[in-house]
């Protein structure tokens, strides 16, 4: 999915809102310097590629953050300001219901979630252009 | 292990600038956020703002905006804090702190006093 | 920005005493707080984070407790050590605020 055409600040907006504190939640414990930060974006439309494949695409150690809080909430924001995104995505969520797992929070799982703090916090930079 | 390590203390007068260096070494240095805290005589303490060594990418507290402007020097592992049109009121001691992507301050530098007199 | 309203502002206290130090968030911070303690010419030094977690080499006579909007900072047997000033912060949203700090004195 191109995610050009998504209404950023709408998308920002809802980060501040609500996702960046299911983030605190899911990562509450974890010690600050836990994990060094190795995933970067360097425009809007790329942090938000990143963003997707790191929420919703299962990696080894960690399959499960899909179902998570800030997960579900990415993609409704995702489905909302982001023209067409979410018909591309019916395929992607059939195959994942079949795949449905018991919620394991791994230290995989809480390495990516870091990550994924850092992809929304660049993406939230108010000079990162749209290209 | 992880060491910040700060410039000596600092005499301004009014009207000028002063610039603090904070030494990192213990870790990878683009890999954490490098912030600056400060606390005026007997006060509380103020987060001034963030630098991402990774890109040099700042943002500021709205109270330093368009005053504070922290750089990085990645040859030597260092960051610096500058501050402008000092005035008696940022006498204070300034702290580099370290921080994930969760912020809380594991990591201090031992602190620069910067007095602002005329 | 988050106001971090923390009391008391000054504690007196003798060794052993046990004493609560409290912090008031002006909106939900989860569970996103430190506690740091500080002496004079001195960096903070963290004690907690995430409300209740220990940092390494903390002394298990300080805890952490709270959620949402109100924080408490336990010392359960004071000792000598501890008397210094206190802080709490909140990192749960930008810009991030620490409260005014408690100094706990000698009775």
């Known amino acids: 999915y191109d995610f050009t055409n998504c209404d950023f600040e709408k998308i920002k907006a809802a980060y501040l809102s609500t996702i960046s504190k299911d983030l605190i939640t899911y990562m509450s414990g974890t010690k600050s310097t836990e994990f060094n930060n190795t995933v970067s974006c360097s425009n809007r439309p790329h942090c938000l590629t990143e963003i997707q494949s790191l929420t919703f695409n299962p990696t080894a150690g960690c399959a499960s953050l899909a179902k998570e809080m800030f997960a579900m909430k990415t993609k409704a924001a995702l489905a909302i300001w982001c023209p067409g995104y979410s018909e591309t995505q019916i395929n992607a969520t059939q195959a994942m219901k079949k795949r449905r797992k018991r919620k394991v929070t791994t230290n995989k799982c809480l390495e990516q979630v870091s990550q994924l703090q850092g992809l929304w916090r660049r993406f939230n930079r108010p000079l990162l252009k749209q290209q | 292990q992880v060491q910040l390590v700060q410039s000596g203390a600092e005499v301004k007068k009014p009207g000028a600038s002063v610039k603090v260096s904070c030494k990192a070494s213990g870790y990878t240095f683009t890999s954490y956020l490098m912030h600056w805290v400060r606390q005026a005589p007997g006060q509380g303490l103020e987060w001034i703002g963030e630098?991402?060594?990774?890109?040099?990418?700042?943002d500021y507290n709205q109270n330093f905006r368009g005053r504070a402007t922290m750089t990085v020097d990645m040859s030597t592992s260092t960051v610096y804090m500058e501050l402008s049109s000092l005035r008696s009121e940022d006498t204070a001691v300034y702290y580099c702190?370290?921080?994930?992507?969760?912020?809380?301050?594991?990591?201090w530098g031992q602190g620069t006093l910067v007095t602002v007199s005329s | 920005d988050i106001q971090m309203t923390q009391s008391p502002s000054f504690l007196s206290a003798s060794v052993g005493d046990r004493v609560t130090i409290t912090c008031k968030a002006s909106q939900d911070v989860v569970t996103a707080v430190a506690w740091y303690q500080q002496k004079p010419g001195k960096a903070p030094k963290l004690l907690i984070y995430w409300a209740s977690m220990r940092h390494t080499g903390v002394p298990s006579r300080f805890s952490g407790s709270g959620s949402g909007t109100e924080f408490t900072l336990t010392i359960s047997s004071l000792q000598p050590e501890d008397f210094a000033t206190y802080f709490c912060?909140?990192?749960?949203?930008?810009?991030?605020?620490f409260g005014q700090g408690t100094k706990l004195e000698i009775k």
């Open positions: 702190a370290l921080t994930g992507t969760i912020n809380y301050f594991d990591y």
């Open positions: 630098i991402d060594p990774s890109d040099s990418y700042t």
């Open positions: 912060q909140q990192y749960s949203s930008f810009t991030f605020t």
